[in-house]
Amino acid sequence: DGCKDIFMKNEILSASQPFAFNCTFPPITSGEVSVTWYKNSSKIPVSKIIQSRIHQDETWILFLPMEWGDSGVYQCVIKGRDSCHRIHVNLTVFEKHWCDTSIGGLPNLSDEYKQILHLGKDDSLTCHLHFPKSCVLGPIKWYKDCNEIKGERFTVLETRLLVSNVSAEDRGNYACQAILTHSGKQYEVLNGITVSITERAGYGGSVPKIIYPKNHSIEVQLGTTLIVDCNVTDTKDNTNLRCWRVNNTLVDDYYDESKRIREGVETHVSFREHNLYTVNITFLEVKMEDYGLPFMCHAGVSTAYIILQLPAPDFRAY
């Protein structure tokens, strides 16, 4: 059918609550394109009728709510004037929420479910709620170890829980809960977050500092090999992960089939008060689809990107 297949990460979700996934693949979806969602290679598209429990809402697929039997591989087909991309998303549904039982619960945690607070400082947790505009989210309630959070050290601000003067006792299992309204119906969304505590050392505060890249573009010829380093300084006792992502997916997972773009092995140099980490990204062969796409270096809560750009034509050659 001429569509290029792109395999996205697995999404691990809780049953009996709403879930949405947006089909975006810049720069493809930034132009005039049509997006159609399918389940398990079915020829019949997902319904666009808003009363349907599972339906397409603009570029999103929306589950109201997600159910145990909804696990599977979903495809969104992005058709442009001269291109076609088929993005595969593997959704795995788990039935139970941790506060109800430990049985059949989340068996492993993606980065979105893990957050860090910094000892002795004012810090915050974020409730990741990604839904289309048709979904209205009410105020967020926060829970720690299955009891609602109360107390003057905690303040709810939009999707964040502000925690003042973080203590060691603040580690644990948190959940954020919101009521989502869609077409007059209300649904509960509950996201689990496991929180660890880290100390800030003297060097440069607790937030890792990305020295390079600096959110900029790199001119590179089509077909060439390119290696870009991400250089990060961080405290010696940090627990932060450093990685390259594209479309919020680890590059090694995103390019799992072709292995054309890979993350390198991390190295570090130890200084008296901090470490300097380097992790590179290698483009074995730069292709047209790489241009305009932000390749993100992540280091804990810090991010920085590069965007590949075709060199401007050199008119002196003519």
Partner: antibody, heavy 119, light 108 residues
Framework: QVQLVQSGAEVKKPGASVKVSCKAS????????MHWAKQAPGQGLEWIGE????????NYNQKFQGRVTMTRDTSISTAYMELSRLRSDDTAVYYC????????????WGQGTLVTVSS | EIVLTQSPGTLSLSPGERATLSCSAS???????LHWYQQKPGQAPRLWIY???NRATGIPDRFSGSGSGTDFTLTISRLEPEDFATYYC?????????FGQGTKLEIK
Amino acid sequence: QVQLVQSGAEVKKPGASVKVSCKASGYTFTSSWMHWAKQAPGQGLEWIGEIHPNSAKTNYNQKFQGRVTMTRDTSISTAYMELSRLRSDDTAVYYCARVDYGKPWFAYWGQGTLVTVSS
Amino acid sequence: EIVLTQSPGTLSLSPGERATLSCSASSSVSSSYLHWYQQKPGQAPRLWIYSTSNRATGIPDRFSGSGSGTDFTLTISRLEPEDFATYYCQQFQSSPLTFGQGTKLEIK
């Protein structure tokens, strides 16, 4: 390091009740579910139920429902399992075991408590 | 409930030999939720392999786990004297949690 220390052996008469304790240390007691399992002499393991120490929510194996009560005292980081209307086939070693968020398996076990039911 | 059946009940082998322990589930179990424990007489069980194929901390690499759906296997490539014990498989997918009846690995 993480430790689950259980109370000592008990001898009970049929029809009586027994309450076994499990004292946790080395981690945040209120963050993990505590489970209980039974192992009769020379037999395999049987799951009894679980309790969340912070919310006190419990889930029991239907086989033990009505005879088992799980409680906790967060001030001393201790979980309890009480079994009532004891019968001779309740003679067993009882274990507590802990389950962490995102890790649905028993990584830590108590040393076990032998309960003997005999007239 | 999910019934786990282990085979054989007893396995008699000599040190240096390869051991294969099987665990069969009455209905499909996600690989994330199938675990193995080792137990020696008078001791509490100890987590040995979690999520089908991951060795717990300190478990030697002669132990490996595999399988999916309803059939799971624990393999010991070369038996050492300290490996002789009873091994239980267990599922954490649905309530009630269940264990296999155990495979006793004894010295021949």
